[in-house]
């Protein structure tokens, strides 16, 4: 059974995967970002179903993509530094949902904008924490 | 209701330019890109090239590199498009559009495009 | 320079299901849109982002993507919906677009 203290550790994982989320959010959706328009375009794959951790092997499976439409948004209006934010988000993700599982990822069959895609993960962050407070 | 109105028909003599004006109302001009697209007669639709309204910035077609201008009058709320040393096969309808999505996401009219009413550009000898 | 694919025509019988293919290498990560021409009137979008379908479009209209291939399907075909058909995509890095070939659909 986990112990008050993986519950906090995982507490603090999930609000700090959240945070990253919403920053990546924030920096793209701003008028002065002028490549939203254009990464608008590209298209990413929704977990069928997101509700216990072991589900964030669709995040994990997604961040690449991600990282390259970020990648597009970088100017001197744009502080985000793709690489390491991923990188970041990469290992928080590995430490949720645990490397000894081997979970399958289901996709949806709709796809979904960088801002929904984003929008949908902070969702199951906040869903999740406030199944653990 | 947003509006695109295109300046009206062209006849140009080949090595000469052409210059098309696209003037939008109804909408917040520089939240949204503008597409330029040309149909040839009996042909299909090619992408031409895109335009900032909020900064200028531009991607042209490849094949267009070097004879197209696109530029905007942020005062006027209307783009241009200009072609340079004109060919016989640059005969067609010239459509401006109205980028699908805005500047701002949460915009609920972004996701559907707007076109203008074509203007047909002739190159004849 | 990157490119769309569709087949020139596609012939169905009113009532009938007409399906209109696109293929191109980027069409995994990058959305395909649909656009009806109707002879000597202006494009109009039937479909977005792959499946969505803007407000005033039937619902016989909708849109798929799978792999390198997006499929625009029309339902129950009327004859109103004899027109040409075009997917538009932007190339892998978001900047370049493209139109397919067209496809020109006969319902008779």
């Known amino acids: 059974a986990p112990t008050s203290s993986s519950t906090k550790k995982t507490q603090l994982q999930l609000e700090h995967l959240l945070l990253d989320l919403q920053m990546i959010l924030n920096g793209i959706n701003n008028y002065k970002n002028p490549k939203l328009t254009r990464m608008l375009t590209f298209k990413f794959y929704m977990p069928k179903k997101a509700t216990e951790l072991k589900h964030l092997q669709c995040l994990e499976e997604e961040l690449k993509p991600l990282e390259e439409v970020l990648n597009l948004a970088q100017s001197k209006n744009f502080h985000l530094r793709p690489r390491d934010l991923i990188s970041n988000i990469n290992v928080i993700v590995l430490e949720l949902k645990g490397s000894e599982t081997t979970f399958m990822c289901e996709y949806a069959d709709e796809t979904a904008t960088i801002v929904e895609f984003l929008n949908r993960w902070i969702t199951f962050c906040q869903s999740i924490i406030s199944t653990l407070t | 209701e947003v509006q695109l109105v295109q300046s009206g028909a062209e006849v140009k003599k080949p090595g000469a330019s052409v210059k098309v004006s696209c003037k939008a109302s109804?909408?917040?001009?520089?939240?949204?890109?503008i597409s330029w697209v040309r149909q040839a007669p009996g042909q299909g639709l090619e992408w031409m090239g895109w335009i900032s309204a909020y900064n200028g910035n531009t991607n042209y077609a490849q094949k267009l590199q070097g004879r197209v201008t696109m530029t905007t009058d942020t005062s006027t709320s209307t783009a241009y498009m200009e072609l340079r040393s004109l060919r016989s096969d640059d005969t067609a309808v010239y459509y401006c559009?109205?980028?699908?999505?805005?500047?701002?996401?949460?915009?609920?009219?972004?996701?559907?495009?707007?076109w203008g009413q074509g203007t047909l550009v002739t190159v004849s000898s | 320079s990157y490119e769309l694919t569709q087949p020139p025509s596609v012939s169905v019988s009113p009532g009938q299901t007409a399906r209109i293919t696109c293929s191109g290498d980027?069409?995994?990560?990058?959305?395909a849109y649909w656009y009806q021409q109707k002879s000597g009137q202006a494009p109009v979008m039937v479909i977005y982002e792959d499946s969505k379908r803007p407000p005033g479009i039937p619902e016989r209209f909708s849109g798929s993507s799978s792999g390198t291939m997006a499929t625009l399907t029309i339902t129950g075909a009327q004859v109103e919906d004899e027109a040409d058909y075009y997917c538009y995509s932007t190339d892998s890095g978001g900047d370049v677009s493209v139109f397919g070939g067209g496809t020109k659909l006969t319902v008779l």
């Open positions: 109804g909408y917040t001009f520089t939240s949204y890109g």
């Open positions: 980027a069409l995994p990560r990058k959305f």
């Open positions: 559009a109205r980028d699908l999505y805005s500047l701002y996401y949460y915009d609920s009219s972004g996701k559907f495009d707007y």
